[in-house]
């Protein structure tokens, strides 16, 4: 099918920059400023991506391929190239309607964006808790109690807890 | 506005050799393909040579061998060297800016005036 249309159609040679001008007989014309076209044999030139507001430019347009945008400090990307910018929060927290929340007991989140997740529960491995959760971090789980040898450790193997994770205090 | 000016035609005898220059105007040159065309005295026109932007050639086959087809972008002009001309290479040569920068099965948008190449002993 490629061969074609490459044989039926007159425009399917005009190199990727330019377009195949209707208003010139089909010759083969630049592509005007601030528009480019990615592929050859295109009949029109795409408007090139304007990163404005919270977007500010990571490459700029060219002839050939649209300009891609990246977010400012503060802020994050989400979708596919970037077609929103989301609020950054610290660590410890996650971005609600109303804003940045810190996370509940018994959650954390490590990064600047993305949800509290609840701490790894060490016991359903076995495990005891070696290291406690945070806001911040999740929990570091040891080796079950029963590979310890006598005074080997001091670290208490978690009693049932109702909070996933969390050793008594 | 296109503009397409052929010069370098003229009478030279069997054997011999003329280089035609076709100057382009109007369009932006280098991303388009330019072709040359003949028509002989009581003939249709014919296709002869053809180059697109990126250099690619295509020949008719009576003219294999015998004629190449170049172009220099800087200066927006396209030439035709022919060498070991015959009588049967009369004609008036056309220069011809081609749609789609295609040279397989190409056609013509845009023509210039044409230029006068007699061969006789």
């Known amino acids: 099918f490629e061969r074609t249309r490459s044989l039926q159609d007159p425009c399917s040679n005009c190199p990727a920059g330019t377009f195949c001008d209707n208003n010139r007989n089909q010759i083969c014309s630049p592509c005007p400023p601030n528009s480019f076209s990615s592929a050859g044999g295109q009949r029109t030139c795409d408007i090139c991506r304007q990163c404005k507001g919270v977007f500010r430019t990571r490459k700029e347009c060219s002839s050939t391929s649209n300009a891609e945008c990246d977010c400012t400090p503060g802020f994050h990307c989400l979708g596919a190239g970037c077609s929103m910018c989301e609020q950054d929060c610290k660590q410890g927290q996650e971005l609600t309607k109303k804003g940045c929340k810190d996370c509940c007991f018994g959650t954390f989140n490590d990064q600047k964006r993305g949800i509290c997740r609840p701490w790894t529960n060490c016991s359903l491995d076995g495990k005891s808790v070696l290291v406690n959760g945070t806001k911040e971090r999740d929990v570091v789980c040891g080796p079950s109690p029963a590979d310890l040898s006598p005074g080997a450790s001091s670290v208490t193997p978690p009693a049932p807890a109702r909070e996933p994770g969390h050793s008594p205090q | 506005e296109v503009q397409l000016l052929e010069s370098g035609g003229g009478e030279v005898q069997p054997g011999g050799s003329l280089r035609l220059s076709c100057a382009a105007s109007?369009?932006?040159?280098?991303?388009?393909?330019m072709g040359w065309y003949r028509q002989a005295p009581g003939k249709g026109r014919e296709f002869v040579a053809a180059i697109e932007s990126g250099r690619n050639t295509v020949y008719a086959e009576s003219v294999k061998g015998r004629f190449t087809i170049s172009r220099d972008n800087a200066k927006n002009t396209v030439y035709l060297q022919m060498s070991s001309l015959r009588a049967e290479d009369t004609a008036v040569y056309y220069c011809?800016?081609?749609?789609?920068?295609?040279?397989?099965?190409?056609?013509?948008?845009?023509w210039g005036q044409g230029t006068l190449v007699t061969v006789k002993p």
């Open positions: 011809g800016l081609l749609k789609g920068n295609r040279v397989v099965s190409p056609s013509v948008a845009y």
């Open positions: 109007g369009f932006s040159f280098s991303i388009n393909a």
